[in-house]
Interface confidence: low
């Protein structure tokens, strides 16, 4: 049956899917607050542009009858369930915001013909890459693999003089949604990361990981894992670690490393943390006071999704173009818009670009320090600290394969 879009005659709506199975365990009222804050900004921007229109959001709540685990892994049907609700209500906005779970997004793409744009705070997996009407506002797995390959190959920095071509990946299946798909992308044999490495082995048991730390016959000195420092400590504890082991801890959506008075615990000295530069303005906004450093990024992605909708609305209305067209549906990419925290750039496939930051623990100050930054938009690494105070020998990252001499 035909669903009418509430998207013309001066009234424009964004449909926001409110799913219990979200990429981050975020209370739905916080998401609602973020959306409402975004709407206020959009209304102001449209008014300033002389566009006298009405902009609203309709929140579509999942009843959780089919699946109620609150876990993205069980979310395949939930997105379709919500789409059915929209279909029954015969009402839809100009844009669909959500879902954030990779399974939901992928399934919606398989089973529906999306003639309207979809914005997601999540959908990290490779299976959601290159979707023509999908925009992702949190770094997808593809961007992570590009960074890792770029960093592995780098050999011309004062602190990294070896190209790497090997890695262990620790993945035990209990990870958060973002980590699950990031590690999935590293594990997949068809991924860019796997393609560029000569050796890669996935460690699935705690004991496997623990054994590698001091195993003289290990095939790589580098271990990639995903999560926060506490997750690493549970796994590693205070065990001894060979001096040429490097642990890359992917923790993109965690601002805690940049907070005042944060001291790196001793078990982080062999670790490089990959995160993103923190935003600042959300720290004081009304809806984010109760958010953890991790959830700030999720709320910001929802807010920016609304601002993106407003930006596209403004662009099309100023040009006198129709909103309910395939052109509009395919336009949410290859652009920069004014986000809540400054400009936000989307690549040719509608995926957000960001500056990733690689941190190390200074042995002098026990503080996290920026080693280098990586601009996902231009696939470029910028060294920041040319003389890092590393734990590794000669303040240089070791080779990924230990030279054991004649056996």
């Amino acid at each position: 049956s035909q669903v009418s879009q509430n998207c013309h005659n001066g009234s424009y709506e964004i449909s926001v899917l409110m799913m219990d199975n979200s990429a981050f365990a975020e209370p739905l009222e916080n998401v609602e607050d973020a959306v409402n804050e975004g709407l206020e900004i959009v209304r102001g921007r449209l008014q300033n542009a002389g566009l006298n229109v009405t902009v609203n959001a309709s929140f579509m709540y999942s009843d959780g009858l089919i699946h109620n685990s609150g876990d993205c892994r069980s979310s395949t049907c939930e997105g379709l369930d919500l789409l059915r609700k929209i279909s029954n209500a015969k009402r839809m906005g100009c844009v669909l915001m959500g879902p954030s779970c990779t399974y939901s997004t992928f399934q919606m793409y398989l089973d529906t013909e999306l003639s309207y744009p979809m914005i997601s705070a999540g959908s990290f997996g490779l299976s959601c890459d290159y979707k023509e009407t999908l925009t992702r506002l949190m770094s997808p797995a593809r961007k992570l693999t590009y960074f890792l390959v770029n960093f592995w190959k780098t050999n011309d920095l004062p602190f990294k003089t070896y190209s790497w071509s090997t890695s262990y990946v620790y993945k035990n299946g209990t990870e958060s949604e973002d980590c699950f798909w990031y590690l999935n992308a590293l594990e997949a044999s068809v991924s860019y990361f796997s393609h560029e490495l000569s050796f890669k082995l996935v460690l699935r048991q705690d004991k496997e990981f623990q054994d590698i730390l001091m195993d003289h016959n290990r095939k790589s000195n580098v271990i990639v894992m995903c999560g926060g420092p506490e997750f690493l400590y549970k796994l590693k504890g205070d065990r001894a670690v060979a001096e040429d082991i490097v642990i890359i801890l992917v923790d993109l959506f965690n601002d805690q490393y940049f907070e005042d008075n944060v001291t790196a615990p001793d078990y982080m000295k062999n670790v490089l943390v990959l995160t993103q530069s923190p935003g600042n303005s959300l720290l004081n906004s009304s809806f984010s006071r109760n958010l953890s450093p991790t959830k700030r990024d999720f709320a910001l992605a929802y807010l920016n999704g609304i601002l993106l909708f407003g930006h596209m609305l403004k662009t099309f209305l100023e040009n006198g173009e129709n909103i309910t067209t395939p052109k509009f549906a395919h336009a949410f990419r290859n652009l920069t818009f004014e986000g809540y925290d400054g400009p936000v750039t989307l690549d040719d496939w509608g995926d957000v670009d960001s500056t990733m930051v690689l941190l190390y623990t200074s042995v002098d100050t026990k503080k996290y320090k920026v080693l280098l930054t990586y601009d996902t938009h231009v696939n470029q690494t910028n060294p920041v600290d040319m003389s890092p105070t590393f734990t590794w020998k000669n303040s240089k990252l070791p080779n990924d394969i230990t030279d054991r001499g004649p056996q």
């Epitope: 005042d260 530069s277 400054g342 400009p343 500056t355 503080k367 930054t373």
Partner: nanobody, 131 residues
């Protein structure tokens, strides 16, 4: 080798003005955060005014409306115009820079930190506000 050289410090009466300059050389990053950090006697360093490569400027609350940061890219020079100076503005003012930019907001967030962790520093110029 990145070099930052400050000038323009001196003694000035309360309510007076000064203009600090920072000449940068060897700095080739297209994305950066740079600005002015000060250290008063016996106190920690604190961010005063910062500018990111996208032009985003950020000021400490204590100097908003009085200080203005600007840059002349053709001369690779950073400026700090200080008006309505107060006794509490007395400090050594350092020019500082780093090759990081999150659309200006990592730069902005440096303002809130004590002893901001910039990668490059000038030698400092003393500003004394006294009658």
């Amino acid at each position: 080798e990145v070099q930052l050289v400050e000038s323009g410090g001196g003694v000035v009466q309360p309510g007076g003005s000064l203009r600090l300059s920072c000449a940068a050389s060897g700095y080739t990053y297209s994305r950066y955060c740079m600005g002015w950090v000060r250290q008063a006697p016996g106190k920690e360093r604190e961010g005063v005014a910062l500018i990111a490569s996208d032009g985003t400027t950020t000021y400490a609350d204590s100097v908003k409306g009085r200080f203005t940061i600007s840059q002349d890219n053709s001369k690779n020079t950073l400026y700090l115009q200080m008006n309505s100076l107060r006794a509490e503005d007395t400090a050594v003012y350092y020019c500082a820079a780093d090759a990081v930019n999150w659309y200006g907001s990592i730069c902005a967030s440096m303002i809130r930190r004590k002893n901001p962790a910039f990668g490059y520093w000038g030698q400092g110029t003393l500003v004394t506000v006294s009658s």
